[in-house]
């Protein structure tokens, strides 16, 4: 058993048919010594006596909060949770898995340029009695920090009979160089609790590897005189990282219809201009990527051709 | 320890086409060696990632673009001091603070250098001969060299009289590879900063 | 399987007028841009053009323009490419090819043969 | 117009050894660069497309680098179906070019 916050304590079982469970003993916080009694949630039946109770947690019915009282008043609670081990491996009932870059993946995370910032985000189909709290550090001996904001619900979507709910939250190091060469890689942390349930989950990559640009700003076009090639020039993003010279970024450009079947005309370029065919009823995108590390693409940005 | 922006003629540097060179020959051998240890620990993930230029360069610091100076994260306290006479410096304006910087790129490279020739050394001895350096990552890395042209004592090769680790050598390449990869990255950042100053 | 198959070789004289054909089949005919791409005996390849049949819009090669006229006939998913004032060195084995991407070719025709000689 | 400038232009090689070919560009070409095999009497056939995405249902043995102005084709280990002549072509920008050729033949 340990303790995940003020009062409240997270006990680790082993999760199969007819396991002994834990042994817990739980200490009424208060000086009094004598007339102690324990309930346990809302049900007034008196569970034990005395300044401490000892009971044997099994199952979620052992689960949740024991308050002591005396002569009617409450004196202290404690909530108790409980984090389930099957085969040797903690459960991840809470979140989906996004199997995105990879199976068991269960956190995602993007920076939108070197400064340290990052998002994180996560998936789940419970919707309620559910709370999350994040933590985050570079490194983990010897961590330096990084600050992270509220985990908060950014986007329910219908998949079939089911919603899904996405939870993000914002962090931020410290003291981050956009410039510097990472060896210590960032280490996310996400406890998570459903009703009596506890799970954890953890997330450990660079920035480097994360960076996905905001897609190119301000497209344009300019038809070329006796051709049917168009100019199309475009901004870096106001969130890229800065001096652009530095922190480069290449480009590609594609035309193409509403199909991804269609026929297409795609170039890359390290400018920020480029020459296509543009074709009727197609629209020209541009997306962008790290010059130098090959991390993600940008979205697209789009322009109609006409 | 940042670089100035005024600095060689738009176009006029020759470094440039060398580290994008290096980084383009480093992130191929890098993707051969995962491919070719695929049972070895050889990804980011499984690495260790040291530095082997740690306390000995500062790349990051010399070679900082002036608009990062104001960040305090961005200013280490380290300072070094190197023989400043560079052909890649293409201009007399060119301040010590941009040679200083170029010079650390170099001993970058130096020490990369001996290991990677220490390392194949080992790795030719290898019964299984499973993988060697490749000659254009060696030559590339020298054509910077020479394009940077400082003037620096050479680095004894380390020789071993133990009978090499081969796993252990696999493991160190992987490790090398990946932190030679993060280092060409910065230094074609820093050549495309100069080249557009 | 797409395949583009192309018409037979021609022996012309100088000054006169070639008209090579390029049957498609295997997929949509106008989901593909067309290329005509040539190769003189010992020489290297040279892009001569492209249509998009879907509208018939075109784009030459400079070398080329005014001399080359590159058409499609959708109904029977055959390409055109005709080249008039012929010379001498216009003696190549002319290749058309396709791609659902504008700027190169991943299914290429057996090529056909043009001579001019006197 | 760009000019695309392979080199060797023929290179013996040993089946079963490896084996490189350049391509050059006249002006920076980002990654907009593929490579064909030619056959005599054939007609070219894509192996690589955009400097180093691999094509399907061409041998893995076969991949591409390089950005900017300098490319190479690599054969891991050559077949001796691999024998033949192997192009390079831009597509930076109109017109399209391509290299001489460079004919890999058996030493």
């Known amino acids: 058993i340990w303790e995940l916050k003020k009062d409240v304590y997270v006990v680790e079982l082993d999760w199969y048919p007819d396991a002994p469970g834990e042994m817990v003993v739980l200490t009424c916080d208060t000086p009094e010594e004598d007339g102690i009694t324990w309930t346990l949630d809302q049900s007034s039946e008196v569970l034990g006596s005395g300044k401490t109770l000892t009971i044997q947690v099994k199952e979620f019915g052992d689960a949740g909060q024991y308050t002591c009282h005396k002569g009617g008043e409450v004196l202290s609670h404690s909530l108790l949770l409980l984090h389930k081990k099957e085969d040797g491996i903690w459960s991840t009932d809470i979140l989906k898995d996004q199997k995105e870059p990879k199976n068991k993946t269960f956190l995602r995370c993007e920076a939108k340029n070197y400064s340290g910032r990052f998002t994180c985000w996560w998936l789940t189909t419970i919707s309620t009695d559910l709370t999350f709290s994040v933590k985050s550090s570079r490194g983990s001996s010897d961590p330096q920090g990084v600050t992270c904001g509220a985990a908060t619900l950014s986007a329910e979507r219908v998949r079939g009979d089911n919603k899904e709910y996405e939870y993000s939250v914002e962090c931020q190091e410290d003291s981050a160089c956009p410039a510097a060469e990472e060896s210590l890689p960032i280490e996310v942390m996400v406890d998570a609790v459903h009703k009596l349930k506890y799970e954890n989950y953890t997330s450990s990559f660079f920035i480097r590897d994360i960076i996905k640009p905001d897609p190119p700003k301000n497209l344009q076009l300019k038809p070329l005189k006796n051709s049917r090639q168009v100019e199309v020039s475009w901004e870096y993003p106001d969130t890229w990282s800065t001096p652009h010279s530095y922190f480069s970024l290449t480009f590609c450009v594609q035309v193409q219809g509403k199909s991804k079947r269609e026929k297409k005309d795609r170039v890359f370029t390290d400018k920020t201009s480029a020459t296509v065919i543009c074709r009727k009823n197609a629209s020209i995108s541009v997306r962008a990527q790290d010059r130098y590390y090959s991390s993600s693409w940008s979205e697209w940005a789009s322009v109609p051709c006409s | 320890r940042n670089l100035p922006v005024a600095t060689p003629d738009p176009g006029m540097f020759p470094c440039l086409h060398h580290s994008q060179n290096l980084l383009r020959a480093v992130s191929n051998m890098l993707q051969k060696a995962r491919q070719t240890l695929e049972f070895y620990p050889c990804t980011s993930e499984e690495i260790d990632h040291e530095d082997i230029t740690k306390d000995k360069t500062s790349t990051v610091e010399a070679c900082l673009p002036l608009e990062l100076t104001k960040n305090e994260s961005c200013l280490n306290s380290r300072e070094t001091s190197f023989i400043t006479n560079g052909s890649c410096l293409a201009s007399r304006k060119t301040s010590f603070m941009m040679a200083l910087c170029l010079s650390s790129i170099y001993e970058d490279l130096k020490m990369y250098q001996v290991e990677f020739k220490t390392m194949n050394a080992k790795l030719l001895m290898d019964p299984k001969r499973q993988i060697f350096l490749d000659q254009n990552m060696l030559a590339v890395i020298d054509e910077l060299m020479q394009a940077l042209n400082f003037n620096s004592e050479t680095v004894p090769q380390k020789s071993s009289l133990e009978e090499p680790d081969f796993y252990k050598t696999k493991i160190k390449l992987c490790i090398l590879l990946h932190a030679f990869r993060i280092r060409a990255v910065t230094i074609d950042r820093v050549m495309s900063y100069l080249n557009a100053s | 399987q797409v395949q583009l198959v192309q018409s037979g070789a021609e022996v012309k004289k100088p000054g006169s007028s070639v008209k090579v054909s390029c049957k498609a089949s295997?997929?949509?005919?106008?989901?593909?841009?067309l290329h005509w791409v040539r190769q003189a005996p010992g020489q290297g390849q040279e892009w001569m053009g492209w249509i998009d049949p879907e509208n018939g819009d075109t784009e030459y090669a400079p070398k080329f323009q005014g001399r080359v006229t590159i058409t499609a006939d959708e109904s029977t998913s055959t390409a055109y490419m005709e080249l008039s004032s012929l010379r001498s060195e216009d003696t190549a084995v002319y290749y058309c090819a396709r791609n659902k991407e504008l700027r190169y070719f991943d299914v290429w025709g057996q090529g056909t043969l043009v001579t001019v000689s006197s | 117009d760009i000019v695309m400038t392979q080199s060797p232009l023929s290179l013996p090689v040993t089946p079963g050894e490896p084996a490189s070919i350049s391509c050059r560009a006249s002006q920076s070409i980002s990654i907009n660069l593929h490579w064909y095999q030619q056959k005599p009497g054939q007609a070219p056939r894509l192996l690589i497309a955009?400097?180093?995405q691999s094509i399907s249902g061409v041998p893995s043995r076969f991949s591409g680098s390089g950005s900017g102005t300098d490319f190479t084709l690599t054969i891991s280990s050559l077949q001796p179906e691999d024998f033949a002549t192997y192009l390079c072509q831009q597509s930076n920008s109109f017109p399209l070019t391509f290299g001489q050729g460079t004919k890999v033949e058996i030493k």
């Open positions: 295997g997929g949509t005919f106008s989901d593909y841009y």
């Open positions: 955009f400097a180093s």
